[in-house]
Each structure stands twice: as structure tokens, then as C-alpha cells.
């Protein structure tokens, strides 16, 4: 693994993709989504220590300033670098519709 | 302002653009950047309460699951939605070069 992918805090502690099993009720979708009934939600969770999966120059700056002024500047944060697509069947006034979402499930993660 | 831009925590507490004055030393750039000597670093700082500047459907899901499982799922986090370009004059082996960076200064912010 590249240096930027090795977590100095221990395995699984740094920014990475997690899967959370959720029902429509959990997601607050029960009143407008019919299908799927349950979703394996992939999201980005974990710490962003120095040089770990830095997305860009801005993330490097943010980390440097965070070390200098931790009360003012937060550490970079773990967010999706890209997404996986997903289809929902939704309730409409006239029946049902098929909707595609390209920004719903995280595919991979980085620190910004 | 749209509902998603009104901070329920009070003015200035939610995710927004901040400017942090930094020297090359602060940024860790003193050994490879000649100019500018100082940078007005714009970055995204602040809380992401429910429905505030949600970047996409993923952010909505994350907030709903955070409320349900706060120990497992963190709240959405304040990150750049876009960037402003910046030019640096850098030291090189042969002298100096002008480099434009498109991912250095945050332009506006949202919650992901």
C-alpha cells in the first residue's frame, strides 16, 4: 500500500468505506420510496491523520494549519471521492416512477 | 436565503467559508515556494446540522443515520464544493517555475 493508505492509528481506524444496513424507515424514506426495502449504505467514516488519503493540496494545507491552530482549523474529514449509482422506485401522485441517483452510495473515500 | 442556508445554531456557527492568514512556514511550503510569501487560505469550517447545505442525497442519508446511530455514523462534514485557482512561484532544479493549482483555495462550501 502507498504511504497515504497506511493508517498510523491502527487497522480500520482511518478514513475508509463502511457499510451500514438501513431500512427505508432508518433513512426517512418510508413515505416516498417503495423499493428497495432495505439498503446497504456505503459511506466514508474514519480519522484523517496527516498524509492519509489526502484528496488534494487543500487537504494538505488544512492539515498543516490544523496542527498549528487546532482550535480554529479542524482536521481534514473523510468524505466520498466517488459514488456508486442506485435506482429507487418512488411513489408519485399518479403512481410510481423509476429514479436513478448517481450521488447516493459512496464508492471510495478520501480526506478533504 | 434558502432554508438549507439558514443556520439553526446561530450566525456563523454552521458550515461556511473562512479565511485563515498563513505564512509559507505555517503551510510547510517555505522550502519549495518562493511566492506569495503569505496566503489568505479560504477553507470550509463549521457544523453541518440537519438539512443545512446538504451536498447531495448521500449527505441526507448520512444525517438520518447519524441521528439514529450517532456512535457509528458521524454527522456530515463541511468541505469545499468548489475551488478557486491559485498561482505559486516554485523553486526548481533549474531555477523557478510558475504553477497554477486548481484545488488549493476553497470557493464555496457544503455538507457531505
Amino acid at each position: 500500500a502507498r504511504n497515504g493508505d497506511r493508517c498510523p492509528l491502527g487497522p480500520g481506524r482511518c478514513c475508509r468505506l463502511h457499510t451500514v444496513h438501513a431500512s427505508l424507515e432508518d433513512l426517512g424514506w418510508a413515505d416516498w420510496v417503495l423499493s428497495p426495502r432495505e439498503v446497504q449504505v456505503t459511506m466514508c467514516i474514519g480519522a484523517c491523520p496527516s498524509q492519509f488519503r489526502e484528496a488534494n493540496m487543500h487537504a494538505q494545507i488544512k492539515m498543516n494549519l490544523h496542527r498549528l491552530k487546532p482550535d480554529t482549523v479542524p482536521a481534514p474529514c473523510c468524505v466520498p471521492a466517488s459514488y456508486n449509482p442506485m435506482v429507487l422506485i418512488q411513489k408519485t401522485d399518479t403512481g410510481v416512477s423509476l429514479q436513478t441517483y448517481d450521488d447516493l452510495l459512496a464508492k471510495d473515500c478520501h480526506c478533504v | 436565503a434558502r432554508n438549507g442556508d439558514r443556520c439553526p445554531l446561530g450566525p456563523g456557527r454552521c458550515c461556511r467559508l473562512h479565511t485563515v492568514h498563513a505564512s509559507l512556514e505555517d503551510l510547510g511550503w517555505a522550502d519549495w515556494v518562493l511566492s506569495p510569501r503569505e496566503v489568505q487560505v479560504t477553507m470550509c469550517i463549521g457544523a453541518c446540522p440537519s438539512q443545512f447545505r446538504e451536498a447531495n442525497m448521500h449527505a441526507q442519508i448520512k444525517m438520518n443515520l447519524h441521528r439514529l446511530k450517532p456512535d457509528t455514523v458521524p454527522a456530515p462534514c463541511c468541505v469545499p464544493a468548489s475551488y478557486n485557482p491559485m498561482v505559486l512561484i516554485q523553486k526548481t532544479d533549474t531555477g523557478v517555475s510558475l504553477q497554477t493549482y486548481d484545488d488549493l483555495l476553497a470557493k464555496d462550501c457544503h455538507c457531505v
Partner: antibody
């Protein structure tokens, strides 16, 4: 494991109707959607429609509106497709397919062969 | 309706060959394309979802790529059990549509 057991082959006369069944087992019936797909001999696949087992909401391919009626019986974990005013063009293999994600078809029945002939 | 065109209609290959099957959509469908295998007198079987995502239980020699209008199913070393029909299906909009299929046969 998830299984979809379809009814046996049918030989019916032109103009008649027929009701095909698809019995689900190995999962909670209302957890997955049911789709129906037509395949004529040596040809491709055609999506007929989708049904939501929890309350019977359905959506049809416009081409099959009036030709097919989709229903479910949650008490017996069975989905049905009735085909009306049959012609030789309706002779085909009909598959039911269960979907955990509404985008694709992950579980298929074995198919029911329908022959329309006088 | 979205039309999916598969090519070639028939592909004759030798076990061990690497093959690529094409599926072209009449308009952009992002990543909303799925691949199935169907052997003679059997039901279709899902191989790849959302253009490139693998399916549990499907051999790793099957892979998918593409987005927008052009998609490819690759089999990196064909085995005898892989011969049959291959169909693509789109879920970008209703009605769902399938390609006409590619027949993979032994040379």
C-alpha cells in the same frame, strides 16, 4: 435460499386467457419486488412489468398494458400474471424474477412455456 | 424506449481466449447497465450489475466496464461452461429493455 417456482407449461386456444403463477420461498415475500419477462423462441428478453408485493402496486411496459395483469397473494407468497386475448404472438417462455434492488433481476424462476394454438 | 444493441451477434472462440462483448445504448444511461448469461433451456443469471460491479458467486474472470452509451463485458479466459447467450439490460428508465444478445459458441 431464494427460490421462485413457476407453474407448468400451458397450451391454450387463441382468444382465451391464462394465469401463470410464481411461488416464492426462502425469503420474506414482501421484501423483494417481482418482475415478469417474456422470451420468444430464439429471441431476446422483454420486460413485461413490475409489482410491489406489499400492496400490489404495479407498473407495466406500455406494450403489455391490457395484455398482462399482475397480482400477488401475500398469504401464499405467490405472484401471478394473467394474459388476455391470447394470440400466437403470445407463445413464449415467461419468467418471473425477484429483485432485491429494483435495477436488475437477481433471482429467476425456471420459466413457464405458453403455447397458443388452435 | 432505450434501444440496446449488442455486438457481435455470434462470437466463436476457443477455451482460454479472452473475449469482449459489446452493448451500445441509444442514449446515455450512465452506469445503469447489467449483464446476464443464459444457457440453453435455462433461466438467465446475473453476472455484473451497474456496468462494473461484481456479483457474489460469479467467477472473477467476468468483468464489466463502460458508462454512458458504450459498455463491455469481458471474460478473461473463457471456460467451456461459459458458452451460451449473453444479454445486457438497462435500468436507467422504464420500460427496462434488453439487448438482442450475443451468442458465445465454441470454435
Amino acid at each position: 435460499q431464494v427460490q421462485l417456482q413457476q407453474s407448468g407449461p400451458e397450451l391454450v386456444k387463441p382468444g382465451a386467457s391464462v394465469k401463470l403463477s410464481c411461488k416464492a420461498s426462502g425469503y420474506t415475500f414482501t421484501s423483494y419486488d417481482i418482475n415478469w419477462v417474456k422470451q420468444r423462441p430464439g429471441q431476446g428478453l422483454e420486460w413485461i412489468g413490475w409489482i410491489y408485493p406489499r400492496d400490489g402496486i404495479s407498473k407495466y411496459n406500455e406494450k403489455f398494458e391490457g395484455k398482462a395483469t399482475l397480482t400477488v397473494d401475500t398469504s401464499s407468497s405467490t405472484a401471478y400474471m394473467e394474459l388476455h386475448s391470447l394470440t400466437s404472438e403470445d407463445s413464449a417462455v415467461y419468467f418471473c424474477a425477484g429483485t432485491s434492488d429494483p435495477a436488475y433481476f437477481d433471482y429467476w424462476g425456471q420459466g413457464t412455456t405458453l403455447t397458443v394454438s388452435s | 424506449d432505450i434501444v440496446l444493441t449488442q455486438s457481435p451477434a455470434t462470437l466463436s472462440v476457443t477455451p482460454g481466449d479472452r473475449v469482449s462483448l459489446s452493448c451500445r445504448a441509444s442514449q446515455s444511461i450512465s452506469y445503469y447497465l447489467h449483464w446476464y448469461q443464459q444457457k440453453s433451456h435455462e433461466s438467465p443469471r446475473l453476472l455484473i450489475k451497474y456496468a462494473s460491479q461484481s456479483i457474489s458467486g460469479i467467477p472473477s474472470r467476468f468483468s464489466g466496464s463502460g458508462s454512458g452509451t458504450d459498455f463491455t463485458l469481458s471474460i478473461n479466459s473463457v471456460e467451456t461452461e461459459d458458452f451460451g447467450m449473453y444479454f445486457c439490460q438497462q435500468s436507467n428508465s422504464w420500460p427496462y429493455t434488453f439487448g438482442g444478445g450475443t451468442k458465445l459458441e465454441i470454435k
